[in-house]
Amino acid sequence: KSPIFGPEEVNSVEGNSVSITCYYPPTSVNRHTRKYWCRQGARGGCITLISSEGYVSSKYAGRANLTNFPENGTFVVNIAQLSQDDSGRYKCGLGINSRGLSFDVSLEVSQGPGLLNDTKVYTVDLGRTVTINCPFKTENAQKRKSLYKQIGLYPVLVIDSSGYVNPNYTGRIRLDIQGTGQLLFSVVINQLRLSDAGQYLCQAGDDSNSNKKNADLQVLKPEPELVYEDLRGSVTFHCALGPEVANVAKFLCRQSSGENCDVVVNTLGKRAPAFEGRILLNPQDKDGSFSVVITGLRKEDAGRYLCGAHSDGQLQEGSPIQAWQLFVNEESTIPRSPTVVKGVAGGSVAVLCPYNRKESKSIKYWCLWEGAQNGRCPLLVDSEGWVKAQYEGRLSLLEEPGNGTFTVILNQLTSRDAGFYWCLTNGDTLWRTTVEIKIIEGEPNLKVPGNVTAVLGETLKVPCHFPCKFSSYEKYWCKWNNTGCQALPSQDEGPSKAFVNCDENSRLVSLTLNLVTRADEGWYWCGVKQGHFYGETAAVYVAVEERKAAGSRDVSLAKADAAPDEKVLDSGFREIENKAIQDPRLFAEEKAVADTRDQADGSRASVDSGSSEEQGGSSR
């Protein structure tokens, strides 16, 4: 499919001008290659009319130009003094006319309306309001006032001062007679339809002395604004419908076959399933405007979108609307990254988030999409030290591996963590990507004690058991804080005995804290990584208390200091449901009751072989 995009249809009137914008992927080659505008012949060729290399056909001499905007990835063709002869099929493109890097454009130039003398022209957008003013003389002040519409050869009564309203206008028309001082009446038509366009006649009086005034009403269908976005990127539609619809339900819909427009999202709570997890509708201040953000763009998202306002929350005749034509460029600069990441209850996930590598200094963010109301995405963590309170100790945003990717690690997973998350930066807003976390059956691979108490001034050793599947990975311990996880020295204690059916390649790696101080209290993570790519992690909260008796503490998984109501598994490991808690010192009081939805036998699942867009919690 050609990545060139422009308007499918351009309509104008004789004598007027048009400006046609064509979009292309702004690669280095594309920015500098030839741009052209050509007319398609009956036999399939395409005759160049104007190009960026200076050529201008004699047909366009003195009335057209082509300007390239390489920084935007667009070029613009302006054509003036249009005639009906300019109607036809054209292409805007890059390179050689026959190469296929082009977009088809239909140009329709119509004859201007033949208007009677003294005709007032009203040009109004679809769905809006028009006021037709009708002057009259004093002698007709007391006489009947009326508005007719010319249908074919005959005038048809639309409204009059005796109370008649044509059924086609019921509920959306009124006739106002100004105060005695002004010799004027006006007809106000709301929620204008395309069928309202045409020639009108207002009249005061019915005899030969009546006053008449011609009016021509043109109802404009909104020209779609062209929007060109990258596959996997995001788009924002800004919809400004005016203060008169500030309190009316708003919607965004996508046109399907014919005149149907399927609701994508509306303020009444409707949202199309295909947009679950990747759309926000944001009401704006005062004026009834709103914006809709869609992330994780797919090729099937391309098409014509309309936003509007109607009490039903969907497109109806007479809704004021705005239109966009969205083109999704499949030659995307946004790299593929997994759209689904799987983890097990009690385990962890490491999510890779792409960003524009030119913006390495930008602030990185991760938020949780919530579908309630119109959708919102509260921030969970950023690269400047913000961590949402409920996530302290189990969530970290790391700048690694860098060069266009950052990492978010979330551990102590529960079923409540399943959902959609957005990766964002404060640089190029189009780089918002969506990832879904799924909680699947299985057990965490890394095994650590549930909670640990250290004694001031003593030495503490905390074990982390790594199964043999991680034999080739780097193993580490780190201390969590709100800006990351600071690496700590650890000791390899040899093979672990914590795993059934696991050979000498399993490992027990311990963290040792010498001469414990109050500053050592907090969350510690053990984990695996390969270079700058992070895999699974497990978290332990270390509380610090006053010395009771001398000696050092060596914490094992099957330590007998389990709380009385903790469940000890057959294999001798304490199983703790790692709830995110606001005061980790309450951790010992937490009842470790297994959530049957979250805990299951069997090992972790990894990448689904059926999808290159999914990743397991520890794979990359």
């Epitope: 201040d285 602030i363 995405c377 921030l379 950023d382 400047e384 913000w386």
Partner: nanobody, 126 residues
Framework: EVQLVESGGGLVQAGGSLRLSCAAS?????MGWFRQAPGKEREFAAA????????YYADAVKGRFTISRDNAKNTVYLQMNSLKPEDTAVYYC??????????????????????WGQGTLVTVSS
């Protein structure tokens, strides 16, 4: 639930300065100042992110007003210099504890701020 209490408003002569403070009962990712002049709609004045690295200003106050925050005290400030009679308004402090402004790019949008103070009156006489 975040409670916000503004202070620092008062009467000042044109060209003078005032410093508004807003004390919050808990931490918030984004904090903002909005104002409402008599007979007018409430409008955005300034906003600041958690770290203070991102600040936003309405065109009408750019270069004259400075927003800052002290996270240790959960307080946000609005330093207003070169005040004009048209700055006369009730100034409201607003908080977005969840940081929803980031994904929506709604830093200037009152809908994004879930918590509001009672307001403090600033009167600039000519």
């Amino acid at each position: 639930e975040v409670q916000l209490v503004e202070s620092g408003g008062g009467l000042v002569q044109a060209g003078g300065s005032l410093r508004l403070s807003c004390a919050a009962s808990g931490r918030s990712y984004a904090m903002g100042w909005f104002r409402q002049a008599p007979g007018k709609e409430r409008e955005f004045a300034a906003a600041i992110s958690w770290s203070g690295s991102r600040t936003y200003y309405a065109d009408a106050v750019k270069g004259r007003f400075t927003i800052s925050r002290d996270n240790a005290k959960n307080t946000v400030y609005l330093q207003m210099n070169s005040l004009k009679p048209e700055d006369t308004a009730v100034y409201y402090c607003a908080a977005d504890p969840d940081g929803t402004v980031v994904a929506s790019s709604g830093w200037t949008n009152s809908y994004e701020y879930g918590y509001w103070g009672q307001g403090t009156l600033v009167t600039v006489s000519s």
